[in-house]
């Protein structure tokens, strides 16, 4: 136990500050991007070095579900994450320096809403404070964007094509190519968040294969070309 090693805190005659929290009214970001929710605070315990907890919740103050929580040990500037919903929330600020700013990764439209920061001093100075009005996060929709398109070797000297796109709402993907009927049956893979992947399992002919991603905001296209070397019978491609 290291509790006997606590450091002394000098009394200062400076006037004590009141509890307050500073957050912007609104933060805007596009789906798929990251956003920072700023939150700074003042408190009356000028040299508080005891344990503390930083919390962010969504929906409503005091009662909304927590999306992020971290705790810092006495005298530590390291806030250990105890909760980060879907692993997408990360503390950017340093609570020991009155900053609870939060970064939210891989935004989806469903993340829109109000977020409330809260700090709890859990040591001798048992005290807590939470922003009442919070910060409103507006996540705007995003037109489709193809982030990766590739041809990969498949079984039995065949080839397959993969297309990954992002957008909000998640785009629908379709493959088209040189095969008769032109439009090929694509296996729509399970995406995560705003990303989706479609596979064309067997490329039977040489030529251009095009992946199209479309949602309510627009469409995007990207193509790959397959040209196989046709050697003597039995040779691999």
């Amino acid at each position: 136990d290291a509790s006997g090693d606590l450091l002394n805190t000098e009394a200062h005659s400076a006037p004590a500050q009141r509890w307050s929290m500073q957050v912007p009214a609104e933060v805007n970001a596009e789906a798929g991007d990251a956003a920072v929710l700023p939150c700074t605070f003042t408190h009356p315990h000028r040299h508080y070095d005891g344990p503390l907890t930083a919390i962010w919740r969504s929906g409503e103050p005091y009662a909304g579900p927590q999306v992020f929580r971290c705790t810092a040990a006495p005298g530590s500037e390291l806030c250990q994450t105890a909760l980060s919903l879907h692993g997408r929330f990360r503390l950017l600020g340093n609570p020991r320096r009155n900053d609870l700013s939060l970064r939210v990764e891989r935004l989806a439209l469903a993340d829109s809403g109000r977020y409330f920061c809260r700090v709890e001093f859990t040591g001798d100075a048992h005290d807590r404070y939470e922003s009442r009005h919070g910060v409103r996060l507006r996540v705007t929709a995003a037109a489709p964007r193809i982030v990766n398109i590739s041809v990969l070797p498949g079984p039995a000297h065949a080839f397959r094509a993969l297309c990954t796109a992002e957008g909000e709402p998640p785009p629908a993907l379709a493959w088209s190519g040189p095969a008769p009927g032109n439009s090929s049956a694509a296996l729509q893979g399970q995406g995560h968040g705003y990303q989706v992947t479609a596979e064309l399992p067997a490329l039977t002919r040489d030529g251009r294969y095009t992946c199209t991603a479309a949602n309510s905001l627009g469409r995007a296209e990207a193509s790959v070309y397959l040209f196989r070397f046709h050697g003597a019978p039995g040779t691999s491609t």
Epitope: A2, E10, H47, E77, L78
Partner: antibody
Framework: QVQLKQSGPELVRPGASVKISCEAS????????VNWVKQRPGRGLEWIGK????????YYNEKFKDKATLTADKSSSTAYMQLSGLTSEDSAVYFC?????????WGQGTLVTVSA | DIVMTQAAPSVPVTPGESVSISCRSS???????????LYWFLQRPGQSPQLLIY???NLASGVPDRFGGSGSGTAFTLRISRVEAEDVGVYYC?????????FGGGTKLEIK
């Protein structure tokens, strides 16, 4: 009580790498950053970087970003610093420091000598 | 990077007297929260550095109250009253307001 015990002296060839350790005891290792500091003979102190062993948050001094790699093993309460591409400029005593405010306790130092 | 300057490489002092060691920063170390992020360390000959003062004016655990820290946002003083033989060594200031943390060049306390 709080203790930081560092690995012993190292004599290494130019261009080689070395990994030095800092074993913590007497407090909850994952609750505090471990800082690393360089001191060349007769010179002052230089901050290399710090690692939060539990959250794997790492901050480097840009000057050492390509030189030092900080890691930590929670199970053994040990922080490590690997130094690569060693030259005579890297001959120094390296200290780890941790606990309250990141610098309340220091290891005894590890002397690294780079010589052909 | 914030540059920390300790102008005096050494200061001679007679045991029992008081001495002040100064340090300057190229930028104010006063944070908006009212804290000034400056440390003072003592490194005795052949030993590891030891924390004396944190946040400019707070005495670390186990440090005699003969030591005291004061200053403004950019000019800092470590004062040692009734200097003892065990106080000899090199005194370093260090800022930890911003990355990278930076140390002063050190001031050697020598007994006359």
């Amino acid at each position: 009580q709080v203790q930081l015990k560092q690995s012993g002296p190292e004599l290494v060839r130019p261009g080689a790498s070395v990994k030095i350790s800092c074993e913590a005891s007497g407090y909850t290792f994952t609750d505090y950053y471990v800082n690393w500091v360089k001191q060349r003979p007769g010179r002052g102190l230089e901050w290399i970087g710090k690692i939060g062993p539990g959250s794997v948050s790492i901050y480097y001094n840009e000057k050492f970003k390509d030189k030092a790699t900080l890691t930590a093993d929670k199970s053994s309460s040990t922080a490590y610093m690997q130094l690569s591409g060693l030259t005579s400029e890297d001959s120094a005593v390296y200290f780890c420091a941790s606990y309250y405010y990141g610098f309340a306790y220091w290891g005894q130092g590890t002397l690294v000598t780079v010589s052909a | 990077d914030i540059v920390m300057t300790q102008a005096a490489p050494s200061v001679p002092v007679t045991p029992g007297e008081s001495v002040s060691i100064s340090c300057r920063s190229s930028k104010s170390l006063l944070h908006s929260n009212g804290n000034t992020y400056l440390y003072w360390f003592l490194q005795r000959p052949g030993q590891s550095p030891q924390l004396l003062i944190y946040r400019m004016s707070n005495l670390a655990s186990g440090v005699p109250d003969r030591f005291g820290g004061s200053g403004s946002g950019t000019a800092f003083t470590l004062r040692i009253s009734r200097v003892e033989a065990e106080d000899v060594g090199v005194y370093y200031c260090m800022q930890h307001l911003e990355y990278p943390y930076t140390f002063g060049g050190g001031t050697k306390l020598e007994i006359k």
